[in-house]
């Protein structure tokens, strides 16, 4: 916290101060609280409309949550000398709707970035890479938290939101060192197929609470370091053989699949067989069918092949109107 002013005192064993002013100017920006020992600056719930210019050079952890920043321009944190120690930056819930290219440039130690709970109508492809080069300098980011950044429908650009986020994640191959990526609660209908291939160091991937229907075109093969894959609360109906084989081939992974509307018909047979033998899925005994109606709430692990049938498709000549 900011230092208080002092006045001289004649009491024994007391610090005497030269004047009513602190001897050294306070380095904590207005509307912020600072801890030098924790190397932390908190400018929280202060309705700030821009990033303070006078951030102390010692800052390692910067909280700018609950503000009204609206736009994060290029070089929003660029200072001379640079904020060389800034390692964790939390901008969640600050009403950001636009993050421009190079917004996080000149932060050489930035390892963790949280942009959650901002309605990002525009996320520049170069927000994290800083340049439009085909291969840019590696970003120092290790953890990127982008939960609930989907804007309301009326603020969406013409292009798909999934595509906009994917473009920022793959630009310049800058995020090759990323270990943690959280993309929960973003109404994703699909995961663009090239994204994961550009993030080979991922250990933790959270895609929970989206609207993913299928993983058919998603490849996890490259993610040899993946330890946690969160797919809870999506719209997944079934995992097909290709996906099952890829997940089984990842040496350290734990997959979370709770609360998906699994369709327990003949297409589910391979997944049920796999679930019975795999150690990859956490809480697999909790997975239950949602469809068809006759199978609702049945536990997947308790199904056998006889339970998993598909209604025959009648040839057109036999169909009745």
């Amino acid at each position: 916290t900011s230092s208080a002013s002092s006045s001289s005192s004649s009491a024994p064993f007391l610090a005497s101060a030269a004047s009513a002013q602190p001897p050294l100017p306070d380095q904590c920006p207005a509307l912020c609280e600072c801890s030098e020992a924790a190397r932390t600056v908190k400018c929280v719930n202060r309705n700030l409309t821009e990033v303070p210019t006078d951030l102390p050079l010692y800052v390692r952890n910067l909280f700018l949550t609950g503000n009204q920043l609206a736009v994060l321009p290029a070089g929003a944190f660029a200072r001379r000398p640079p904020l060389a120690e800034l390692a964790a930056l939390n901008l969640s819930g600050s009403r950001l709707d636009e993050v421009r290219g190079g917004a996080f440039e000149h932060l050489p130690s930035l390892r963790q970035l949280d942009l959650s709970h901002n309605p990002l109508a525009y996320l520049s492809p170069f927000a994290f890479s800083g340049s439009n080069a085909s291969i840019s300098a590696p970003s120092p980011l290790v953890e990127l938290i982008l939960n609930h950044i989907v804007p309301p429908d009326d603020k969406r650009q013409n292009r798909s939101f999934e595509g906009m986020v994917a473009a920022a994640l793959v630009a310049g191959r800058a995020l090759q060192g990323l270990h943690l990526l959280e993309l929960a609660s973003n109404h994703f209908l699909y995961l663009p197929r090239d994204v994961l291939a550009q993030l080979p160091s991922l250990r933790y991937l959270d895609l929970s609470n989206n609207s993913l229907v299928s993983l058919t075109y998603v490849s996890f093969r490259n993610l040899t370091h993946l330890e946690s894959l969160h797919l809870e609360d999506n719209a997944l109906k079934v995992l097909h053989n290709g996906t099952l084989a890829e997940l089984q081939g990842l040496p350290h992974v734990r997959v979370f699949l709770d609360n998906n509307p699994w369709v327990c018909d003949c297409h589910m047979a391979d997944m049920v067989t796999w679930l019975k033998q795999t150690g990859v899925v956490q809480g697999k005994d909790r997975l239950t069918c949602a469809f068809p109606e006759k199978m609702r709430n049945r536990v997947l692990l308790e199904l056998n092949s006889a339970d998993l049938d598909c209604d025959p498709i009648l040839p057109p000549s036999l169909q009745t109107s």
Partner: antibody, heavy 119, light 106 residues
Framework: EVQLRQSGPVLVKPGASLKMSCKAS????????MTWVTQSHGQSLDWIGL????????TYNQKFKGKATLSVDKSSNTAYMDLNSLTSEDSAVYYC????????????WGRGTSVTVSS | ENVLTQSPAIMSASPGEKVTMTCSAS?????MHWYQQKSSTSPKVWIY???KLASGVPGRFSGSGSGNSYSLTISSMEAEDVATYYC?????????FGGGTKLEIK
Amino acid sequence: EVQLRQSGPVLVKPGASLKMSCKASGFTIADYYMTWVTQSHGQSLDWIGLINPYSGETTYNQKFKGKATLSVDKSSNTAYMDLNSLTSEDSAVYYCARWRLGYYAMDYWGRGTSVTVSS
Amino acid sequence: ENVLTQSPAIMSASPGEKVTMTCSASSSVSYMHWYQQKSSTSPKVWIYDTSKLASGVPGRFSGSGSGNSYSLTISSMEAEDVATYYCFQGIGYPYTFGGGTKLEIK
């Protein structure tokens, strides 16, 4: 009002140990590094060490390693320094001071604790 | 360790006289600080970041220097300036003080 209130003067016998205190007011001690400095009679100042009250991490002047031990009690907003195996050469005034990370300097100082080691 | 050598060790000046004292560092530093200590009191930060005056310090004081050589100047000596002045570096461990310059009045 920022103040650093140090414990009173002490007379101790050679070989003894002592613990002196530095109670902070006007600021939260956990937010600032605290440092200790010694001054023998009529001599210059000598930096003893630094403690980060937030993490408990300490950094010592090699010269005082094994002689001084720094600690803090965040709940009472107080910094402490233990001195052990005291000899007459340890007779001095010991100051606590608040360290300013952005300046690499001390801003507020206590009045000092006078230590006399004599048999 | 970075040894700071102050000179002169003792000096006296008449009221109104210009006073300059120096601090030489065995290794280059980017900033030097100066502390004033009056008899039987604790030191006070007087000049920080080489040339900036701490709050309440009279404008007749100034600081300058770079690298290995720094100085503190009083443009016009006054009686209240009688004290010992210490230079200090807090960049490299161990942090070190100069031996001090004791300023007296004629």
